[in-house]
């Protein structure tokens, strides 16, 4: 039954979708962004305890014009899942509870077998999500590759398929800046560089504050970070534009310390107006 | 990648009233942006190592507008926008490190002073 007139069950199981997702809620998943190659997902290692793998399996005729050629019932239809060391099987979810397959894993949760139906009927389509624990991912992990193989005792040649994601460590740093004040004014008379003794001789004062915040782990484990400010010190013809008087980093060194930045500002050694600090 | 400078929004903060400007308002048409990314200014990059950067850091930079340059070059200009840019860079042996939103643009508007004295 369900095997056509020739009584030979020629199924056409196809894994039409295998893509990594972020888990938004218990049964809501969002596909990960894709790399430029269009086939590799991008997984940001930033505290996501699990990753979803969306799987869609169909059993449809390969040629709608010849529906009897294949697409018969797939008996003992299964999906075999081989996980890398960095991922472990945690559970299965489906948008439609009726479509949720029974999935069993081995002891170390590295192999999973999902029962898709016995049989998986002609014309059937099933979508479900494997929930995979990311606890095994380390900063050395650069790629996730899950091998997937459909299996059935019906007549069909089946080949393994891989779902891939490139792992990157996204530093949760945010940066914002402001100028104090936001508007400046110029006036008076032209004076040469040599006539400048004090910073007050130069022109209107301005202070920039650039704040960097790190929402994640300490950067010490990842490398060395630098905060850079592109300071427009001269116009295109080489005349002074913004004269840098003082550059200080607060909070990147240790309690109460003021960090040193390079190069040193105030190259004309003008007298500092202490009232401005 | 550096983001484009913030644009002045129409009908928002206007430049001071033009009645005191020594040149006619017809001449005072230009709005100039001084920005190293556009090649209209030259920049020195101050780089500050974040040695023990666990939560936050603030870079404080004090400067002075070089009055004489503006008087010589821009006294007939309606307004100038001076752009300062800042970013974070990370040096690491880890190949798959990625920074998002790691740059910011800080614009300042500059005008000829109606009071005709250098602000102190």
């Amino acid at each position: 039954q369900g095997c056509g007139e020739d009584k030979i069950c020629q199924s056409n199981l196809q894994l039409v979708r295998a893509r990594f997702c972020t888990r938004v809620s218990d049964t809501e998943f969002q596909p990960l962004p894709m790399d430029v190659d269009g086939t590799t997902a991008l997984f940001a290692l930033s505290g996501q305890p699990v990753i979803g793998l969306e799987l869609m399996v169909t059993n449809l005729p390969s040629d709608p014009a010849q529906p009897q050629a294949d697409g018969d019932d797939a008996h003992e239809a299964q999906l075999l899942v081989m996980l890398p060391d960095s991922l472990h099987y945690s559970g299965v979810r489906a948008l439609d509870p009726a479509e949720k397959p029974l999935c069993l894993s081995n002891e170390n949760a590295s192999h999973v077998e999902c029962e898709l139906g016995n049989p998986m009927k002609r014309g059937a389509q099933v979508t479900f999500y494997l929930i995979l624990s990311t606890s095994g991912i380390s900063i050395e992990t650069t790629e996730l590759e899950v091998e997937l193989l459909l299996a059935t005792i019906s007549e069909q040649e089946l080949h393994p398929v891989s779902a891939r994601a490139r792992v990157f460590i996204e530093l949760p740093l945010s940066i914002a800046g402001m100028a104090i004040p936001q508007q400046l004014f110029f006036s008076g008379v032209v004076r040469g560089e040599r006539a400048m003794q004090s910073e007050r001789d130069v022109g209107s004062k301005v202070k920039y504050e650039v704040t960097v915040s790190n929402q994640g782990q300490s950067l010490r484990t990842l490398g060395s970070a630098f905060l850079n400010i592109m300071w427009p010190h001269e116009i295109a013809n080489g005349k002074w534009l913004l004269y840098p008087m003082q550059v200080e980093l607060e909070g990147g060194q240790g309690p109460g310390q003021k960090g040193l930045c390079s190069p040193r500002p105030n190259i004309l050694h003008l007298d500092v107006d202490s009232r401005d600090r | 990648e550096l983001e484009p400078p913030e644009q002045q929004e129409p009908g928002e903060r206007q430049e001071p009233s033009m009645s005191w400007w020594p040149v006619s308002s017809a001449e005072k048409k230009k709005n100039i942006t001084l920005d190293c990314a556009r090649g209209t200014a030259n920049c020195v990059v101050f780089s500050c190592p974040l040695y023990s950067f666990d939560r936050a850091a603030v870079l404080h930079v004090w400067g002075r507008l070089w009055n004489s340059t503006f008087l010589e070059e821009y006294s007939a200009v309606k307004s100038l926008e001076v752009i300062v840019r800042a970013n974070i860079t990370v040096k690491s042996s880890i190949k798959n490190l990625m920074l998002r939103d790691a740059s910011t643009v800080i614009p300042v508007m500059v005008y000829l002073d109606p009071m005709a004295v250098v602000a102190e």
Epitope: A176, G177, M178, I180, P181, Q182, Q183, L184, F185, K205, K207, T211, S213, Q215, E248, E250, G251, P255, G256, K258, R275, D276 | E9, E12, R13, P16, R55, A56, A57, V58, H60, T104, A119
Partner: antibody
Amino acid sequence: EVQLVESGGGLVKPGGSLRLSCAASGFTFSSYTMNWVRQAPGKGLEWVSSISIVGNYIYYADSLKGRFTISRDNAKNSLYLQMNSLRAEDTAVYYCARRKWEHDAFDIWGQGTMVTVSS
Amino acid sequence: SSELTQDPAVSVALGQTVRITCQGDSLRSYYASWYQQKPGQAPVLVIYGKNNRPSGIPDRFSGSSSGNTASLTITGAQAEDEADFYCTSRDNSGNHVVFGGGTKLTVLG
């Protein structure tokens, strides 16, 4: 939920001292410049003091003449205001407020704590 | 020290447009921020920077600036907008913050 909660207010005699606290939660406290602002009964808002992220830059309203000291403990997510030589005119609701990174604006305020200076 | 001057009181008919102004020398250099305060409550930021609204603030609130005057405009005032409004900016030293005296907005009708 991002919030600031002030405490430590109360009734104090002229010349006395009081220490106000502000407990921050729901955000990375050590990333923000913090401020105290006060409001006398029936009057307007008056800025009191500000402190930068690790306390290197501290400013006070001129009218306070060294009687108040602002401090912070980032490990405890707390802001403090030590008020000495209190006067009747210091009677006010004292608010702590967080300053936005990219603008001179106080985007999060506490509910305030009342300080009454009276004999 | 700089001062910011506001009208003590302003009234507007329900659904009409009202403008609250703030004057001060420091506003030539600094953008004003605007706060709404209802009786017995803490102030709430409504406008900051050029004309930025924090999330949750209705778009009937807008800000603008010209010369030494900053303005807060409420287009189509609602009964719930009745409150005290304060402007603030840095003072000319750049290190201190100064508040305006406040404007009591009454919504009529």
